[in-house]
Interface confidence: low
């Protein structure tokens, strides 16, 4: 399977909400022994390998934001910790999973990574990630709503397996 990032760049005004999205592509094993660990974290643009560093999003680490479920099941984080920080991650039946960030500030600007780990018999079998940039703007040049820029087809299905 692969992870696609429909949009590589999100440009949003301060105070707006944004939903960053990734999509699981390709055949997904629905066996009872297979689950998917999906999560989000921040990383650094200047890395040798994009998304290799896992930094918190608003002080929430990737395990705080993770979803753990089978195949294309739906799930979402509803715990108070994420909601207190204006965050919610979610996954639907179609392989889409997302993180919603509320009341954006300039500090939210940066590189965001989605991570999917396929777990078989409790062992990590396969891991892929996607990356996208969030730019939060303020002042007269800021857009009135979030503007999204589609990934090129090459980028949107970029897969990095460790």
């Amino acid at each position: 399977f692969k992870v696609a990032t429909p949009y590589s760049l999100y440009v949003c005004p301060e105070g707006q909400n944004v939903t960053l999205t990734c999509r699981l592509l390709g055949p997904v094993d629905k066996g009872h022994d297979v689950t998917f660990y999906k999560t989000w974290y921040r990383s650094s643009r200047g890395e040798v390998q994009t998304c290799s560093e896992r930094r918190p999003i608003r002080n929430l680490t990737f395990q705080d934001l993770h979803l753990h479920h089978g195949g294309h099941q739906a799930a979402n984080t509803s715990h108070d910790l994420a909601q207190r920080h204006g965050l919610e991650s979610a996954s639907d039946h179609h392989g889409n999973f997302s993180i919603t960030m509320r009341n954006l500030t300039l500090l939210d600007s940066g590189l965001y990574c989605c991570l999917v780990v396929e777990i078989r018999h409790h062992h990590s079998e396969h891991r892929v990630h996607g990356a996208m940039e969030l730019q939060v703007q303020t002042g007269k040049d800021a857009p009135s709503n979030c503007v999204v820029y589609p990934s090129s087809s090459q980028d949107s299905e970029n897969i990095t397996a460790a």
Epitope: Q63, L81, R127
Partner: antibody, heavy 123, light 106 residues
Framework: QVTLKVSGPGILQPSQTLSLTCSFS??????????VSWIRQPSGKGLEWLAH???????RYNPSLKSRLTISKDSSSNQVFLKITSVDTADTATYYC???????????????WGQGTTLTVSS | DVVMTQTPALMSASPGEKVTMTCSAS?????MYWYQQKPRSSPKPWIY???NLASGVPARFSGSGSGTSYSLTISSMEAEDAATYYC?????????FGGGTKLEIK
């Protein structure tokens, strides 16, 4: 409480393979967010990060040494291993393992270190 | 590689004196981490995410900085602060340490 203990051969000859073991207690490397690194320090000098292994078996290596390094783990026996092939006198150092917990309260630093083991490479 | 340069390499301070040591990164990093090491001991975590004190670190210590320039400050030097301090970045592989600043008590 969390403890880490490093064991190794003490002395090796050039071109031999170094095998180090980090035995730990007080935490599980199967726990989401857990990781262990290897760091070394030549006598009287600074620290050099070598490799890191995450709970999900994801691995990171120092690129300058990557061809000689292999990090692995046995979560069930609470051990992390490091192999360095073709050692030379430049590999003479104290080797440490350290835990890195990507947790909410104490994110992203080595919070517990092993006591270190000294390796001397000499012919 | 991100090269971490610590200055000064060696410094001494009298009890009660304010101490500042710096760590300069060859390219911008998001956060800085500091460790304290005393002779014949393993390093101890001291400051993480640039300005947060690790457990048990006295409040006279502080950390600050951004981009390529970071610093560790002791507001009032005490004898137990004599040690070598290392900075480290987790921004890009290899996750490099600085060469250390050795702080002595006068």
């Amino acid at each position: 409480q969390v403890t880490l203990k490093v064991s190794g051969p003490g002395i090796l000859q050039p071109s031999q393979t170094l095998s180090l073991t980090c035995s730990f207690s007080g935490f599980s490397l199967s726990t989401s967010g857990m990781g262990v690194s290897w760091i070394r320090q030549p006598s009287g000098k600074g620290l050099e990060w070598l490799a890191h292994i995450y709970w999900d078996d994801d691995k990171r290596y120092n690129p300058s040494l990557k061809s000689r390094l292999t990090i692995s783990k046995d979560s069930s026996s609470n051990q992390v291993f490091l192999k360095i092939t073709s050692v030379d006198t430049a590999d003479t150092a104290t080797y440490y393992c350290a835990r890195r917990l990507d947790g909410y309260n104490d994110p992203y630093y080595f919070d517990y270190w092993g006591q270190g083991t000294t390796l001397t490479v000499s012919s | 590689d991100v090269v971490m340069t610590q200055t000064p390499a060696l410094m001494s301070a009298s009890p009660g004196e304010k101490v500042t040591m710096t760590c300069s990164a060859s390219s911008s990093v998001s956060y800085m981490y500091w460790y304290q090491q005393k002779p014949r001991s393993s390093p101890k975590p001291w400051i993480y995410l640039t300005s947060n004190l690790a457990s048990g670190v006295p409040a006279r210590f502080s950390g600050s900085g951004s981009g390529t320039s970071y610093s560790l400050t002791i507001s009032s030097m005490e004898a137990e602060d004599a040690a070598t301090y290392y900075c480290q970045q987790w921004n890009s592989n290899p996750y490099t340490f600085g060469g250390g600043t050795k702080l002595e008590i006068k």
